[in-house]
């Protein structure tokens, strides 16, 4: 029986151009985590295999950094990064647990002010 639960950061927001850490935590189970897959809708961002290390999808290699831990750091955020992200925990013997994070990327207020008060 699958007894575990995934805790996530839930709904988060970040500024355009900044970075954000996506983090999930599996609790209430003694199952062994063999791998965590990070996905965005239909796209694979990264895989963290407990034994083999990290696979970063080439489409994201310039903007994704492994860690901290089993988490994932998204860098150089754009408004297009807004959306759902999933952490998929592959465990033994329980099977698969999935957590959801919603990220909203906001226009930077600093950038707006900078544009408004440019030095001639």
């Amino acid at each position: 029986m699958m007894t575990g639960t995934i805790e996530t950061t839930g709904n988060i927001s970040a500024e355009k151009g900044g970075s954000i850490i996506l983090q999930c935590h599996l609790s209430s189970t003694t199952a062994q985590v063999t791998q965590v897959n990070w996905e965005q809708q239909d796209q694979l961002l990264a895989i963290c295999n407990a034994d083999l290390g990290w696979h970063i999808s080439p489409s994201f290699k310039d903007r994704v950094a492994p860690g901290p831990g089993l988490g994932l750091t998204l860098q150089s955020l754009t408004v297009n990064d807004t959306g759902e992200y999933f952490c998929i925990y592959h465990t033994y013997p329980d099977g698969t647990y999935t957590g959801r994070i919603f990220l909203e990327v906001l226009e930077s207020s600093v950038a707006e002010h900078g544009a408004r008060f440019q030095i001639p």
């Epitope: 063999t34 791998q35 796209q43 694979l44 295999n49 034994d51 083999l52 696979h55 999808s57």
Partner: antibody
Framework: QVQLVQSGAEVKKPGASVKVSCKAS????????IHWVRQAPGQGLEWIGG????????SYNQKFKGRATLTVDKSISTAYMELSRLRSDDTAVYYC????????????WGQGTTVTVSS | DIQMTQSPSSLSASVGDRVTITCKAS??????VAWYQQKPGKAPKLLIY???FRYTGVPSRFSGSGSGADFTLTISSLQPEDFATYYC?????????FGQGTKVEIK
């Protein structure tokens, strides 16, 4: 240049063990893992498992767990695959291969080691 | 374990032909698929990684596509050196698994 040079062919009796080596040169282990794949005569490719020299972690195909042991001696940049309790259906070419940098595809392969199990 | 099923298992083609090999995964593997070429008595060589990225030095006539469970390797204009066996591989989860292979023979 990148090279993975494997040890020579082996002939073993059923029940025995074999240890195949894979000497790596031309790259560092950082961000990579070393894998072992076998190919029985006229058959396809079968993943045995992989070893992460950075963490010391190993991942095995359950089919080989308990019979295969993967190790790396970083001081001499050599990976090893030991397979015990050999059976005739373990007769195959055994390949070592390295994963790409922070990717899980296999971009360089050794030349292969033929292991024949026969009484 | 995730099964990777290739089709056809073999095909005969002529130099200059367009060749398409398909690989179907038993479950969604996103884009975690690589393609390899193997010639008799030799080790496999990486052609395509992450479903659609051509590996360094691989001729542009080789292309990969697909996502989810259905993947395709295309050789746009078959050359004499392309006659070989081709394998797909998934690394979405362990154990990593390969297709059974597709042998491309001269017609």
């Amino acid at each position: 240049q990148v090279q993975l040079v494997q040890s020579g062919a082996e002939v073993k009796k059923p029940g025995a063990s074999v240890k195949v080596s894979c000497k790596a040169s031309g790259f560092t282990f950082t961000g990579r893992s070393i894998h072992w794949v076998r190919q029985a005569p006229g058959q396809g490719l079968e993943w045995i498992g992989g070893f992460n020299p950075n963490s010391g972690g190993s991942s095995y195909n359950q089919k080989f767990k308990g019979r295969a042991t993967l190790t790396v001696d970083k001081s001499i940049s050599t990976a090893y695959m030991e397979l015990s309790r050999l059976r005739s259906d373990d007769t195959a070419v055994y390949y070592c291969a390295r994963s790409s940098y922070y990717r899980f595809d296999l971009d360089y392969w050794g030349q292969g080691t033929t292991v024949t199990v026969s009484s | 374990d995730i099964q990777m099923t290739q089709s056809p298992s073999s095909l005969s083609a002529s130099v200059g032909d367009r060749v398409t090999i398909t690989c179907k995964a038993s479950q969604d593997v996103k884009t975690a698929v690589a393609w390899y070429q193997q010639k008799p008595g030799k080790a496999p060589k990486l052609l395509i990684y992450s479903a659609s990225f051509r590996y360094t030095g691989v001729p542009s006539r080789f292309s990969g596509s697909g996502s989810g469970a259905d993947f395709t390797l295309t050789i746009s204009s078959l050359q004499p050196e392309d006659f070989a066996t081709y394998y797909c591989q998934q690394h979405y989860t362990t154990p990593w698994t390969f297709g059974q292979g597709t042998k491309v023979e001269i017609k």
